[in-house]
Interface confidence: low
C-alpha cells in the first residue's frame, strides 16, 4: 500500500503519500476551529507509470497508452485512496462543540 | 456532473471529461482483442480550483491550501468518477470468447 509505512521510509518519485501539515489559520484562513491548531493532512503526489498501483482497468489502459504515446495529454494521476476523519473543537457563542470532519486525513494513495 | 453532456459541449479548462479514442493495436499494442478494434475510453483532465467538483473534504482543504499557497506542490487532481464496462470479443484458439472488461470507459470526472 502507498501509505506512510512505505512512502515515508522510501524516497519515491512515483505516486506516494507525502507529509503535509496544515495550519488552519495560516494555510486555510479558518479562524473558527479552536482545537487543534492544525493537523497532518498529508497529500498524494508522484508519477503514475504503467501498473504502478493502478486503481482500475481504465487506469492501466491510460498508463499503457501514455507509455506508448508519451506526449499524449491523457495520463493517470496520483490521488487519495483511504481517508480518515479529524475531530475538532469549535465554539458557537460560548458553547463548545466537538465535531468529526470526515475525509480530512489521507492515509494512502493510488493512481487513478 | 462533469460528464459528456456538460464537458463535450463547453470549452472547459477546469477538470472535465475529455474525449479519447483508443485503438487497441496501435495505442496499446494489444493484438488479442478481435472486436472492437478500439473504443472511446475518454479521460479526465483540467485544473481543480477551489470547490470545483471536490470529491472529499480533504480535496476542498487541499484546493483552498493551494489557493493560498499557489507555489505548493500539494494540489487536487482531476480523475475519473463513474466508469462503465466494455464488452470485447477475443479468441482462445478457434473458440470465440465474449467478455466484459470492467471500468474501461470513463463517464464522468471529479477533483480528488
Amino acid at each position: 500500500a502507498l501509505d506512510a509505512a512505505y512512502c515515508f521510509r522510501n524516497v519515491q518519485d512515483n505516486c506516494c503519500l507525502r507529509p503535509l501539515y496544515i495550519d488552519f489559520k495560516r494555510d486555510l484562513g479558518w479562524k473558527w476551529i479552536h482545537e487543534p491548531k492544525g493537523y497532518n493532512a498529508n497529500f498524494c503526489a508522484g508519477a503514475c507509470p504503467y501498473l504502478w498501483s493502478s486503481d482500475t482497468q481504465h487506469t492501466k489502459v491510460l498508463s499503457l497508452y501514455n507509455t506508448i504515446n508519451p506526449e499524449a495529454s491523457a495520463s493517470p494521476c496520483c490521488v487519495s485512496q483511504d481517508l480518515e476523519p479529524l475531530t475538532i473543537l469549535y465554539y458557537i457563542g460560548n458553547t463548545p462543540k466537538i465535531e468529526q470532519l470526515s475525509n480530512m486525513i489521507v492515509k494512502s494513495c493510488k493512481c487513478s | 456532473a462533469l460528464d459528456a453532456a456538460y464537458c463535450f459541449r463547453n470549452v472547459q479548462d477546469n477538470c472535465c471529461l475529455r474525449p479519447l479514442y483508443i485503438d487497441f493495436k496501435r495505442d496499446l499494442g494489444w493484438k488479442w482483442i478481435h472486436e472492437p478494434k478500439g473504443y472511446n475510453a475518454n479521460f479526465c483532465a483540467g485544473a481543480c480550483p477551489y470547490l470545483w467538483s471536490s470529491d472529499t473534504q480533504h480535496t476542498k482543504v487541499l484546493s483552498l491550501y493551494n489557493t493560498i499557497n499557489p507555489e505548493a506542490s500539494a494540489s487536487p487532481c482531476c480523475v475519473s468518477q463513474d466508469l462503465e464496462p466494455l464488452t470485447i470479443l477475443y479468441y482462445i484458439g478457434n473458440t470465440p470468447k465474449i467478455e466484459q472488461l470492467s471500468n474501461m470507459i470513463v463517464k464522468s470526472c471529479k477533483c480528488s
Epitope: - | 479548462d13 474525449p19 483532465a45 483540467g46 485544473a47
Partner: antibody, heavy 122, light 112 residues
Amino acid sequence: QSLEESGGRLVTPGTPLTLTCTVSGFSLSSYTVNWVRQAPGKGLEWIGYISYGGSAYYASWANGRFTISKTSATVDLKITSPTTEDTATYFCARHMQVGGAPTGSMAAFDPWGPGTLVTVSS
Amino acid sequence: AAVLTQTPSPVSAAVGGTVSISCQSSQSVYNNNYLSWFQQKPGQPPKLLIYGASTLTSGVPSRFKGSGSGTQFTLTISDVQCDDAATYYCAGGYSGSSDKYAFGGGTEVVVK
C-alpha cells in the same frame, strides 16, 4: 509525430480555398492544432485553433474569414473569400503537451508543418 | 486583442557575445507564464526554443535563456554562434478572449 500542410495554390480573389493539415503519430482527440500564417517577408500571425474536443477558436480579425474543422487525422482551414492580403505561407502547429492536462500548453506550438503557400491574385 | 511588442529589428551581435530581445505584452499572459520563444530561419517553419516563459525545449542549447513574467519578457542568447542568426518571435497565450494567442512582430538577429 508530424504535421504536413497541403492545398496551397494560386487562386483568384473570392474563390474559397481549403488547406489540409495531415497529422501522423498522434491523435487529434488528444491534441489541439493551430493554424498560423506568414505573409512574404512579414511576421507570424495566429489564425485560430481546433481543440482536442472539436471546438474552434479564431483570432478576432480572422472570425468569419476562416473556418477550421477536423476529421480523425486531418485538420482543415477554409479561407472563405480570399483577398490579396491573404497571400501567405500557412502553417499548422500542434500544442505541445506540458504536464498532465491538455490545457497546459503554455503557448508552446511544437511540432510545426513545413507550410503551404497560398497566392491570391487576379 | 493583446499586442506583443518586440525589440526593434535588426539586432546585431558578435560571435561569442550576448544578445537580449525583449517582448512586452499589452496585457498579462495567462498564468503570468504562457509565453514562448521561437526561432525561424528563411524557408523554414518556426522552431520552439522556450515555453512557459523560461523552460528550455529539449535539445535547445542552454545558451538560450528565457525570463520574465506577466507582461514583460526577455530572451537572452549568450555565447552567440553564427548559427543563431535568425528571426526570433515571442508568442503569448491569453484567457477570456477569442484571441487566445498572439505573436510578436519578430526580431532579426544579425551575427557579425
